[in-house]
Interface confidence: medium
């Protein structure tokens, strides 16, 4: 999935495979005058940050189980 | 809907009423050593930031249409 | 090693052209965008212009927009900087810097990660 | 076109301090500000991306923080090395713009 680079968008490709329980938070960027495309960036609890695919139902799944994740997790 | 930039919770409450074309970014932050909290954190567009309800369905759906937002929006 | 190294400043009449250009080494120059940045005397940074790896997008502040472009060659990893209608206020020494900062493949964060040692440009008569 | 604006213009420290730089800008930019160093006479150098993300080889007393408008550099334990001007920049939208620079003096 990848992303036109040219307006100055942070994703580059997306990753597709990411576990919910390696994320320790997730940015979900409006387009603006950076990046025509909204951008979905996770950061890992190893500190490193991923694209994903906002279009994706896995992302989606991912954010819906961190809303709703139990605070004892 | 205050925010607080500490290593602890940074949401000492939650905003209700926010309507989606005002928020730039979604930060979602799952629990951690930093809080045993899901933490939902909306950066709006006049560079203030407001935490949101991670249970409400209405931030689901704000999250929800940011990921499905028409390029053109 | 990374480097960039600028050529092409000097002294030039109110009016006059200079081209700069910046040879970059040690990574694949094609992948990133490339910035200048200028330094008038005891002041601060100033950012000037900007090119997308593959050149097909520009950017420049207002006070360049119109006299100066920012071109590149990928085929002999040089970046360049044609400055027209030079005044009294582009004396400055002229940076070139890599925006690097690709996270793993995924992330992409535009940091001047990487800075040449600068040309002087002074425009006076 | 954002304003990155810097506080203070200069600022004087010893050795063993720790300073606090801040930088504010005229609208959000969320966590797309970057820090750098510079030196009387050399290029800048890279410190801090991503408003808080240490660059690979800058020691760990150097810290940043915020996202939106207001973001800060922290320095603890000040060395004899890192007197010089910081600079703080935005990339969250074109032209890019920097702040106009704190000298960190020797007091």
């Known amino acids: 999935a990848s992303v036109v680079t040219e307006l100055r968008c942070q994703c580059l490709q997306t990753l597709q495979g990411i576990h919910p329980k390696n994320i320790q938070s997730v940015n979900v960027k409006a387009p603006g005058p950076h990046c025509a495309e909204t951008e979905v960036i996770a950061t890992l609890k190893n500190g490193q940050k991923a694209c994903l695919n906002p279009a994706s139902p896995m992302v989606q799944k991912i954010i819906k189980k961190m809303l709703n994740c139990d605070k004892s997790n | 809907a205050s925010v607080v930039t500490e290593l602890r919770c940074q949401c000492l409450q939650t905003l209700q009423g926010i309507h989606p074309k005002n928020i730039q970014s979604v930060n979602v932050k799952a629990p951690g050593p930093h809080c045993a909290e899901t933490e939902v954190i909306a950066t709006l567009k006049n560079g203030q930031k407001a935490c949101l309800n991670p249970a409400s369905p209405m931030v689901q759906k704000i999250i929800k249409k940011m990921l499905n937002c028409d390029k053109s929006n | 090693e990374v480097q960039l190294l600028e050529s092409g400043g000097g002294l030039v009449q109110p009016g006059g052209s200079l081209r700069l250009s910046c040879a970059a080494s040690?990574?694949?120059?094609?992948?990133?965008?490339m910035s200048w940045v200028r330094q008038a005397p005891g002041k601060g940074l100033e950012w000037v212009s900007a090119?997308?790896?593959?050149?097909?997008?520009?950017y420049y502040a207002d006070s360049v927009k119109g006299r100066f472009t920012i071109s590149r060659d990928n085929s002999k990893n040089t970046l360049y900087l044609q400055m027209n209608s030079l005044r009294a206020e582009d004396t400055a020494v002229y940076y070139c810097?890599?925006?690097?900062?690709?996270?793993?493949?995924?992330?992409?964060?535009?940091?001047?990660?990487?800075w040449g040692q600068g040309t002087p440009v002074t425009v006076s008569s | 076109d954002i304003q990155m604006t810097q506080s203070p213009s200069s600022l004087s420290a010893s050795v063993g301090d720790r300073v606090t730089i801040t930088c504010r800008a005229s609208?959000?930019?969320?966590?797309?500000l970057h820090w750098y160093q510079q030196k009387p006479g050399k290029a800048p150098k890279l410190l801090i991306y991503?408003?808080?993300n240490l660059e690979s080889g800058v020691p760990s007393r150097f810290s940043g923080s915020g996202s939106g408008t207001d973001f800060t550099l922290t320095i603890n334990s000040l060395q004899p090395e890192d007197f010089a001007t910081y600079y703080c920049?935005?990339?969250?939208?074109?032209?890019?713009?920097f702040g106009q620079g704190t000298k960190l003096e020797i007091k």
């Open positions: 810097a890599r925006e690097g900062g690709r996270l793993e493949p995924y992330y992409y964060y535009y940091a001047m990660d990487v």
């Open positions: 040690g990574f694949t120059f094609s992948e990133l965008s």
């Open positions: 090119i997308s790896g593959s050149g097909g997008s520009t």
């Open positions: 609208q959000s930019i969320s966590d797309n």
């Open positions: 991503d408003a808080s």
């Open positions: 920049q935005q990339y969250y939208s074109t032209p890019l713009t």
